[in-house]
């Protein structure tokens, strides 16, 4: 058993049918010695008397808010949460496996640049009685500071019969140098509590590996005289690290017909312009990627050919 | 500890092409190592990230773009002085700081070259003959060093008398390649910045 926060405790249980559970001793936070009784949640049934209460915690019915009283007055509370270990592996019931970029990916994180700012998000089908708390650091043995905000509900979607909820959090490394070569990964730890179930999820990454630039901005077409060709031009996104000559991007220019089945023409360039043939009803899209370290491509910025 | 904007004309910078070749070569070699050594811990998540140049060179600090010198987190206190003549410095206007940066890159390349050659000698003794260093990568390191053309004492190749532990050597190869790829990215960024300045 360990303390999650004041008066909230997590009991770790080896979770299998007929498991013996864990013996827990609760102590009433009071100078009083006599006439103390214990109850669980809203029940008035007295579970025991005395300054300490010994309980065998086996399943969720044994978890909850234990309260010690004296003469009708509440003295203190202890909330017991359960953390299930199923065959050597901590349970992951609360969050959905996003399966990207690989199986067992519960937390996904992205950074728009090398400033040390990043966003993480996760999915759940649970809509109520759910709280998250996020901590982060650079490295784990001698951790350096990363400050995270509060997790917020950022999107809701319908997936088949289920509603899916997306939560996200923004974090900022306290002293980040965009040019630095990372040798220690960023660690992100999310505590999730649903009703009386506690789970924790972690992700470890280098900022360089989670870079995903914003799409190029100011995408424009300039028709070339007496030709089906157009000059496409664009600019680096505002959120990208500067100077651009040091933090350079490379670009992919795509000409896509109205039908998804039509052949796509693609051109790769380090410049901020390209000459392409504009077909009728087609659209031109441009996306960006770090020129020297191949992390994710940005989303497409698009303009119609007409 | 930083690069002023007064640097050579774009066409006067022969190192850019070599640094791009270097990044390509080390990335290919790392990919090959990951595939060949699939049963070894060779992914970025599994290896310890060690920098053999730590406390010996200060490339990131010495080559910091002018725009980032206002960022206190970028100004590390490590100072190292280097020999300051080189053929990539194609303009007399080139400052001492730029020479310091390029000579730091040269020292990095020299250290990695020695490590890779020593490692290759060990890998050639492996009866499994599982993996060797790409000669192209070694040649590209050499080409960039020649383009930088700094006078520097030659570092003797490390020779080891004990029987090599091939498992450890292959893990060390992965560690070295990951670190060298990261340094090659920095070198490419620096060359691109200098070329544009």
């Amino acid at each position: 058993i360990w303390e999650l926060k004041k008066d909230v405790y997590v009991v770790e249980l080896d979770w299998y049918p007929d498991a013996p559970g864990e013996m827990v001793v609760l102590t009433c936070d009071t100078p009083e010695e006599d006439g103390i009784t214990w109850t669980l949640d809203q029940s008035s049934e007295v579970l025991g008397s005395g300054k300490t209460l010994t309980i065998q915690v086996k399943e969720f019915g044994d978890a909850g808010q234990y309260t010690c009283h004296k003469g009708g007055e509440v003295l203190s509370h202890s909330l017991l949460l359960l953390h299930k270990k199923e065959d050597g592996i901590w349970s992951t019931d609360i969050l959905k496996d996003q399966k990207e970029p690989k199986n067992k990916t519960f937390l996904r994180c992205e950074a728009k640049n090398y400033s040390g700012r990043f966003t993480c998000w996760w999915l759940t089908t649970i809509s109520t009685d759910l709280t998250f708390s996020v901590k982060s650091s650079r490295g784990s043995s001698d951790p350096q500071g990363v400050t995270c905000g509060a997790a917020t509900l950022s999107a809701e979607r319908v997936r088949g019969d289920n509603k899916e909820y997306e939560y996200s959090v923004e974090c900022q490394e306290d002293s980040a140098c965009p040019a630095a070569e990372e040798s220690l990964p960023i660690e992100v730890m999310v505590d999730a509590v649903h009703k009386l179930k506690y789970e924790n999820y972690t992700s470890s990454f280098f900022i360089r590996d989670i870079i995903k630039p914003d799409p190029p901005k100011n995408l424009q077409l300039k028709p070339l005289k007496n030709s089906r060709q157009v000059e496409v031009s664009w600019e680096y996104p505002d959120t990208w690290s500067t100077p651009h000559s040091y933090f350079s991007l490379t670009f992919c220019v795509q000409v896509q017909g109205k039908s998804k089945r039509e052949k796509k023409d693609r051109v790769f360039t380090d410049k901020t312009s390209a000459t392409v043939i504009c077909r009728k009803n087609a659209s031109i899209s441009v996306r960006a990627q770090d020129r020297y370290y191949s992390s994710s491509w940005s989303e497409w910025a698009s303009v119609p050919c007409s | 500890r930083n690069l002023p904007v007064a640097t050579p004309d774009p066409g006067m910078f022969p190192c850019l092409h070599h640094s791009q070749n270097l990044l390509r070569a080390v990335s290919n070699m790392l990919q090959k190592a990951r595939q060949t050594l699939e049963f070894y811990p060779c992914t970025s998540e599994e290896i310890d990230h060690e920098d053999i140049t730590k406390d010996k060179t200060s490339t990131v600090e010495a080559c910091l773009p002018l725009e980032l010198t206002k960022n206190e987190s970028c100004l590390n206190s490590r100072e190292t002085s280097f020999i300051t003549n080189g053929s990539c410095l194609a303009s007399r206007k080139t400052s001492f700081m730029m020479a310091l940066c390029l000579s730091s890159i040269y020292e990095d390349l020299k250290m990695y070259q020695v490590e890779f050659k020593t490692m290759n000698a060990k890998l050639l003794m492996d009866p499994k003959r599982q993996i060797f260093l790409d000669q192209n990568m070694l040649a590209v390191i050499d080409e960039l060093m020649q383009a930088l053309n700094f006078n520097s004492e030659t570092v003797p190749q490390k020779s080891s008398l004990e029987e090599p532990d091939f498992y450890k050597t292959k893990i060390k190869l992965c560690i070295l390649l990951h670190a060298f790829r990261i340094r090659a990215v920095t070198i490419d960024r620096v060359m691109s910045y200098l070329n544009a300045s």
Partner: antibody, heavy 115, light 112 residues
Framework: QVQLVQSGGGVVQPGRSLRLSCAAS????????MHWVRQAPGKGLEWVAF????????YYADSVKGRFTISRDNSKNTLYLQMKSLRAEDTAVYYC????????WGQGTMVTVSS | SYVLTQPPSVSGTPGQRVTISCSGG????????VKWYQQLPGTAPKLLIY???QRPSGVPDRFSGSKSGTSASLAITGVQAEDEADYYC????????????FGTGTKVTVLG
């Protein structure tokens, strides 16, 4: 004590369907994940499928994906395996099993796919 | 498609020490716990070892398990005639959990 009693096995022609059941008693069935495991005659153990305690997530071996469906009825304390488009290679003893460091197995039920 | 490899058979005379190996990889045994099962002919498997080296109550102490790196082993110290059975190791793969990964199985024969 924990008990898993299986039923539903038998002889079936290729291409036909069969449903196996596993009745649980002696524990809070709705709190635990459950597996199906099979063993072809003279062969080793092969995992077939898993279902979470609340039925929210299901996982299948590639060899049965799209043909077999694992389900549970927590009100009846019963686990099911619906098997469709059966093949000769599905011939095996099928076991249900609880998920956890200490597990309990059903007695097994024989499924024979033969024309 | 078994990724946990066991020897097909091992044998020993009563009182001898018999060991069975179970070889895997970094993503399974290297990252997860190992179990061992005993299966007597015509019966369901019986758990012998969980969490690499833990014995459930009721399992004789002549059975012991260990794990090192990407492989595990089961030892029967002072093998007895009633130990003649098939033995399976089991773990998970970190990418496919909760799918159970079973070993290929080992037939233990007690001679004499």
């Amino acid at each position: 004590q924990v008990q898993l009693v299986q039923s539903g096995g038998g002889v079936v022609q290729p291409g036909r369907s069969l449903r196996l059941s596993c009745a649980a008693s002696g524990f809070t069935f709705s709190s635990y994940g459950m597996h199906w495991v099979r063993q072809a005659p003279g062969k080793g153990l092969e995992w077939v499928a898993f279902i979470r305690y609340d039925g929210s997530n299901k996982y299948y071996a590639d060899s049965v994906k799209g043909r077999f469906t694992i389900s549970r009825d927590n009100s009846k304390n019963t686990l099911y395996l619906q098997m469709k488009s059966l093949r000769a290679e599905d011939t095996a003893v099928y076991y249900c099993k609880t998920h956890g460091s200490h597990d309990n197995w059903g007695q097994g039920t024989m499924v024979t796919v033969s024309s | 498609s078994y990724v946990l490899t066991q020897p097909p058979s091992v044998s020993g005379t009563p009182g001898q020490r018999v060991t069975i190996s179970c070889s895997g990889g970094r993503s399974n045994i290297g990252s997860n716990t190992v179990k061992w099962y005993q299966q007597l002919p015509g019966t369901a498997p019986k758990l012998l070892i969980y969490d690499n080296d833990q014995r459930p109550s009721g399992v004789p102490d002549r059975f012991s398990g260990s794990k090192s790196g990407t492989s595990a082993s089961l030892a029967i110290t002072g093998v007895q005639a009633e130990d003649e059975a098939d033995y399976y190791c089991q773990s998970y793969d970190r990418g496919t959990h909760p799918a159970l990964l079973f070993g290929t199985g080992t037939k233990v024969t007690v001679l004499g």
